[in-house]
Interface confidence: low
C-alpha cells in the first residue's frame, strides 16, 4: 500500500528485568525526512485530542524537549531509514507496546512494537534431532531468544551437570527479522548417555546462573551384552560340562531375539538366554558368543574362547627337506594336537634321545653324513605325554670319502 | 676339560660397536661348533652367530645379519663377535658355546660359558 509508512523489526522482543533490550528497526517514510520521533509505551489514541496518550520514553521534537526516561532510552537511528532503539536498563514495567509515532513534514505514522519483560531471565530452550543413534554425530542446538549489546550472556552445556568437553559454536543475531542467542554443539553419544541429563545454562558474562534448560537424552542403540561362563577361565578337559550365560546390561528399544555363535557361525536351536554344553569334546573348543537383536540391530557380547584340553595325540616329524646334500640346512618339525600346546618335545635319533633338544623345531644349517637316520619325537603337555609317531628319515647325500684303491 | 671364557662386553651406546672374545681350551675334536647365543632377562635364549671348524663356515641369526661378524685366531684358539650398529635389543648376556652341531637356537647345550653382559642404551 502506497499510503503506508515501510518498517521493518521482529514482532516481539523479549527480556527480563534489568537486562537491556535493543530494537532493530528499519523505516522509510511515505515523503521527506523524519522530523518527529516519540516512543510511547502502551499508546492509545485520544478521539478528542486526535492525539496519542501514553507514558513517553523518548521524544526527539525541533524544540529538543527531552523526557527523564532519555538517559535509559536512546534512538540509535535516522532521519529517513535507520529507526534501531535501545532500553539499558530494562524494567519488568516496560512489558506492553511500544509505540514509535513518527512524523515528517506531511505524514504521521505510529508503527508498534511488542516487549515481554519478564521478572526473572527466561531459560533457553534445547532443540535435539528427532531420533538419536549411537556413535552417530548429532547436534545439539540452544536458543534463546534475545541478545542485546549492552549486556553480554553465555550459553553453557552440561552433561549430568559436568561441563561437556566439545567445542561449542555460539552465534548470535540481532537483524530486523530475529533476535537471538544460539550455541550449537556436535556430539557422538555413546550407548552409555541413554538417560542421561543434558543441561543448557545461562549465564552472564562473569559466568554467574542466570537460567537453564535440561533434556534426558534417548540414546537408540543395539543391545548390549555380558557373557559369563562356568568356569570362568573357560579353560575345560574333554567330557566336561560348560555353561555360558548372555545378561543384557542395555537396550534401546527393548531386543527382540537371542542366538549363539560359535566360530562366527550361528548355533542351531539355541535361542535362550543360556548355552549349555555337556561332555564337550575338543571339537566344540572356539570363540563363542551371543547375539541379541532389537530394532536398531544386532547387537554382540565379547567373545569367550572356549579351550577344550586334551593330551597330545601320537607324533608324527615333518622333514624339510629330505633327501638333503651334505652341507644344506635341514629342519625338523614335530607335529601333535595338543591343548594347551606342548610345553617339552623329546626328540630321537635313530631310537636315541637326543639330549638337549627340547623345542618345536630343530634347525640343523649344515648337514653332515652322521645326521642320516630316522628321527622321531615326543610332545608332551600338562596333561600328558603323546605316544612316539612311526618317525621320518633323513638321507644325506654325499660325495665319496676316504676312496682306497684295491 | 673344556673351558670357554668371554671377555668384551660393557656399556655402549646405541649405533655403538663392541668385539666380545672367546677363550677356548680343552676341545679335543677338530671337527666341532662354536659360537655365540644371547639371553636377555625373562626372555627365551637367542643364537646369535654360529662357525664350523671345519670349513669357518658361519651363520647369523636375522635379526643380526649384516651388523655382526663371526671371526677366529686358531693360533690363540680365541672366537670374536664384531657387533656394529648397535641396538638397544641387542642387551643381553651373550654366551659363547661348543658343540657338535650349529642350530638356530644356538650351539647345543653341551659347552658354554659364563657369560659377558652387553647394555645397550639408547
Known amino acids: 500500500d502506497s499510503s503506508k509508512w515501510v518498517f521493518e523489526h521482529p514482532e516481539t522482543l523479549y527480556a527480563w528485568e534489568g537486562a537491556c533490550v535493543w530494537i532493530p528497526c528499519t523505516y522509510r517514510a511515505l515523503d521527506g525526512d523524519l522530523e518527529s520521533f516519540i516512543l510511547f509505551h502502551n499508546p492509545e489514541y485520544n478521539k478528542n485530542t486526535s492525539k496519542f496518550d501514553g507514558t513517553r520514553l523518548y521524544e526527539s521534537t525541533k524544540d529538543g524537549k527531552v523526557p527523564s526516561e532519555q538517559k535509559r532510552v536512546q534512538f540509535l537511528g535516522d532521519k529517513n531509514k535507520n529507526c534501531t532503539l535501545s532500553i539499558h536498563p530494562v524494567h519488568l514495567n516496560d512489558s506492553g507496546q511500544l509505540g514509535l509515532r513518527m512524523e515528517s513534514k506531511t505524514e504521521k505514522w505510529m508503527e508498534r512494537i511488542h516487549l515481554n519483560v519478564s521478572e526473572r531471565p527466561f531459560p533457553p530452550h534445547i532443540q535435539l534431532p528427532p531420533e538419536i543413534q549411537e556413535s552417530q554425530e548429532v547436534t545439539l542446538t540452544c536458543l534463546l531468544n534475545f541478545s542485546c549489546y549492552g549486556y553480554p550472556i553465555q550459553l553453557q552445556w552440561l552433561l549430568e551437570g559436568v561441563p561437556m568437553r566439545q567445542a561449542a559454536v555460539t552465534s548470535t543475531s540481532l537483524t530486523i527479522k530475529s533476535v537471538f542467542t544460539r550455541s550449537e554443539l556436535k556430539f557422538s553419544p555413546q550407548w552409555s548417555h541413554h538417560g542421561k541429563i543434558v543441561t543448557c545454562q545461562l549465564q552472564d558474562a562473569d559466568g554467574k546462573f542466570l537460567s537453564n534448560d535440561t533434556v534426558q537424552l534417548n540414546v537408540k542403540h543395539t543391545p548390549k551384552l555380558e557373557i559369563k561362563v562356568t568356569p570362568s577361565d573357560a579353560i575345560v578337559r574333554e567330557g566336561d560340562s560348560v555353561t555360558m550365560t548372555c545378561e543384557v546390561s542395555s537396550s534401546n528399544p527393548e531386543y527382540t531375539t537371542v542366538s549363539w555363535l560359535k566360530d562366527g557361525t550361528s548355533l542351531k536351536k539355541q535361542n535362550t538366554f543360556t548355552l549349555n554344553l555337556r561332555e564337550v569334546t575338543k571339537d566344540q573348543s572356539g570363540k563363542y558368543c551371543c547375539q541379541v537383536s532389537n530394532d536398531v540391530g544386532p547387537g554382540r557380547s565379547e567373545e569367550v574362547f572356549l579351550q577344550v584340553q586334551y593330551a597330545p595325540e601320537p607324533s608324527t616329524v615333518q622333514i624339510l627337506h629330505s633327501p638333503a646334500v651334505e652341507g644344506s640346512q635341514v629342519e625338523f618339525l614335530c607335529m601333535s594336537l595338543a591343548n594347551p600346546l606342548p610345553t617339552n618335545y623329546t626328540w630321537y635319533h635313530n631310537g636315541k634321545e637326543m639330549q638337549g633338544r627340547t623345542e618345536e623345531k630343530v634347525h640343523i644349517p649344515k648337514i653332515l653324513p652322521w645326521h642320516a637316520g630316522t628321527y622321531s619325537c615326543v610332545a608332551e603337555n600338562i596333561l600328558g605325554t603323546g605316544q612316539r609317531g612311526p618317525g621320518a628319515e633323513l638321507d644325506v647325500q654325499y660325495p665319496p670319502k676316504k676312496v682306497t684303491t684295491v | 676339560q673344556v673351558q670357554l671364557v668371554e671377555s668384551g662386553g660393557g656399556l655402549v651406546q646405541a649405533g655403538g660397536s663392541l668385539r666380545l672374545s672367546c677363550a677356548a681350551s680343552g676341545i679335543t675334536s677338530d671337527d666341532y661348533a662354536i659360537g655365540w647365543f644371547r639371553q636377555a632377562p625373562g626372555k627365551e635364549r637367542e643364537g646369535v652367530s654360529c662357525m664350523y671348524s671345519s670349513d669357518g663356515s658361519t651363520y647369523y641369526a636375522d635379526s643380526v645379519k649384516g651388523r655382526f661378524t663371526i671371526s677366529r685366531d686358531n693360533a690363540k684358539n680365541t672366537v670374536y663377535l664384531q657387533m656394529n650398529s648397535l641396538r638397544p635389543e641387542d642387551t643381553a648376556v651373550y654366551h659363547c658355546?661348543?658343540?657338535?652341531?650349529?642350530?638356530?637356537?644356538?650351539?647345543?647345550?653341551?659347552?658354554w660359558g659364563q657369560g659377558t653382559q652387553v647394555t645397550v642404551s639408547s
Open positions: 658355546a661348543a658343540g657338535p652341531w650349529c642350530f638356530v637356537t644356538g650351539v647345543g647345550r653341551e659347552e
